[in-house]
Amino acid sequence: IWELKKDVYVVELDWYPDAPGEMVVLTCDTPEEDGITWTLDQSSEVLGSGKTLTIQVKEFGDAGQYTCHKGGEVLSHSLLLLHKKEDGIWSTDILKDQKEPKNKTFLRCEAKNYSGRFTCWWLTTISTDLTFSVKSSRGSSDPQGVTCGAATLSAERVRGDNKEYEYSVECQEDSACPAAEESLPIEVMVDAVHKLKYENYTSSFFIRDIIKPDPPKNLQLKPLKNSRQVEVSWEYPDTWSTPHSYFSLTFCVQVQGKSKREKKDRVFTDKTSATVICRKNASISVRAQDRYYSSSWSEWASVPCS
Amino acid sequence: RNLPVATPDPGMFPCLHHSQNLLRAVSNMLQKARQTLEFYPCTSEEIDHEDITKDKTSTVEACLPLELTKNESCLNSRETSFITNGSCLASRKTSFMMALCLSSIYEDLKMYQVEFKTMNAKLLMDPKRQIFLDQNMLAVIDELMQALNFNSETVPQKSSLEEPDFYKTKIKLCILLHAFRIRAVTIDRVMSYLNAS
């Protein structure tokens, strides 16, 4: 058993039918010695008397808010949450596995640049009695500071019969140098509590591996005289790290017909312009990626050919 | 992904082309190592990230773009030994910081070259003959060092009398390749920045 925050305790349990459970001793936070009784949640049934209460915790019915009283007055509370260990693996019932880029990916994180700012998000089908708390650091043995805001509900979507809720959080490394070569990963830890169930999720990454630039901006077409060709030009996104000659991007230019089946023409360039053939009803799209470290491509920026 | 190759103009900063080749070569070698050593801990998540140049060179600090010198988090340590007279420096552009930066890159390459050659000698003794260092990568390191053209003492190749532990050698290869790829990215960024200056 360990303290999550004041008066809230987590009991770690080997979780299988008929498991023996854990013996827990609760102590009433009071100088009083006599006439103390204990109750659980809203029930008035007296579970025991005395300054300490010993209970065998085996299932969720044994968790909840234990209260010690004296003569009708509340002396203190202890909220017991359960952390399930199924066959030796901590349970992951609260969050959905996003399965990208691999199984057991519950937290996903992205950064728009090398400033040390990043966003993480996760999914759940649970809509009520749910709280999250996020902590982060650079490295774990001698952690360096990363400050995270509060997790907020950022999207709701319907998936089949279920509603899916997306939560996200923004974090900023306290003293980040964009040019630094990372040797210690960023660690992100999310505590999730649903009713009386506690779970924790972690993700470990280097900023360089979660970079996803914003799409190129100011995408423009300039028709070339007496030709079906057009000059496409664009600019680096405002959110990308500077100077651009150091933090360079590479670009992919795509000409896509109206039908998804039509052949796509693709050109790769390090410049911020390209000459392509614009077909009728086609659209031109451009996306960006770090030129030297192949993390994610940005989303496409698009303009119609007409 | 193969990086697009720009053919350097005669007047172009001459090391840019070599640094692009270096990044391509080390990236290919790392990819090959990850595939060949799939049952070894060789991914970024599995390895310890060690920098063999730590406390010996300070390439990131010495090569920091001017725009980032205002960022206090980037200014941990800016002192390092330096040598001037690299051939990548057009004489008009020679500056103290630039010479310091390029000499630091040269020292990095020299240290990695020694490590890789020592490691290759061990890998050649492996009866499994599972993996060797790509000669192209070693050649590209050499080419960039020649283009930088700094005079410095040659470091003797390390020789070891004890029987090599091939498992440990292969894990060390993965660690070295990951670190060298990160340094090659920094070198490429620096060359691109200097070329634009």
């Epitope: 299932e59 399930k84 066959d87 693996i89 992951t92 019932d93 609260i94 | 801990p41």
Partner: antibody, heavy 112, light 107 residues
Framework: EVQLVESGGGLVQPGGSLRLSCAAS????????MVWVRQAPGKGLEWVAS????????YYADTVKGRFTISRDDAKNTLYLQMNSLRAEDTAVYYC?????WGQGTLVTVSS | DIQMTQSPSSLSASVGDRVTITCKAS??????VAWYQQKPGKAPKGLIY???HRYSGVPSRFSGSGSGTDFTLTISSLQPEDFATYYC?????????FGGGTKVEIK
């Protein structure tokens, strides 16, 4: 006493469908992840699918992905396996399990 | 996928013997390994989880050990009711995979 009882097996033609059920008792079913495992005649054990408590996370073996669907009804204390596009190689005894307890199994035979 | 290679595939032993069954994973699975016992015509039953933890009610003569890639199930003193087929399983990553089984027969 913990009990898991499978039902719904039988003989089915290739391409056909079956729905297996597993009735659970003796424990708080809704609080536990559950799995289906199968065993072809005279062969070893093969994991088929898993479902977490609350159905938030579901995983399938590649051999059944897209054809089989695992689900649960916590109000009825029942685990299901909907099997579509059945093939001869799906012939096996299907067990539902919540370690260390396994059901007695139900035989599925796919044959024309 | 992670392969679990169990050995031997069968063995003959007498009551009172110490029996050791090994299981080798094709890659590191930490301690996320379970062992099962299956008697002819019956369902499997869980014996060990987390490589070395006995489920409640499993006799203490059964013990498990190992981590990473090499795992062992030991029956310290074979009893008549222990003649069965034993399977190891990794649950470190999906798909979950079982060993091919070890049949323990009476000598």
């Amino acid at each position: 006493e913990v009990q898991l009882v499978e039902s719904g097996g039988g003989l089915v033609q290739p391409g056909g469908s079956l729905r297996l059920s597993c009735a659970a008792s003796g424990f708080t079913f809704s609080d536990y992840g559950m799995v289906w495992v199968r065993q072809a005649p005279g062969k070893g054990l093969e994991w088929v699918a898993s479902i977490s408590s609350g159905s938030s996370n579901i995983y399938y073996a590649d051999t059944v992905k897209g054809r089989f669907t695992i689900s649960r009804d916590d109000a009825k204390n029942t685990l299901y396996l909907q099997m579509n596009s059945l093939r001869a190689e799906d012939t096996a005894v299907y067990y539902c399990a919540r370690n260390p307890y396994w059901g007695q199994g139900t035989l599925v035979t796919v044959s024309s | 996928d992670i392969q679990m290679t169990q050995s031997p595939s069968s063995l003959s032993a007498s009551v009172g013997d110490r029996v050791t069954i090994t299981c080798k994973a094709s890659q590191n699975v930490g301690t996320n390994v379970a062992w099962y016992q299956q008697k002819p015509g019956k369902a499997p039953k869980g014996l060990i989880y987390s490589a070395s933890h006995r489920y409640s009610g499993v006799p203490s003569r059964f013990s498990g050990s190992g981590s990473g890639t090499d795992f062992t199930l030991t029956i310290s003193s074979l009893q008549p009711e222990d003649f069965a087929t034993y399977y190891c399983q990794q649950y470190n990553s999906y798909p979950l995979t079982f060993g091919g089984g070890t049949k323990v027969e009476i000598k």
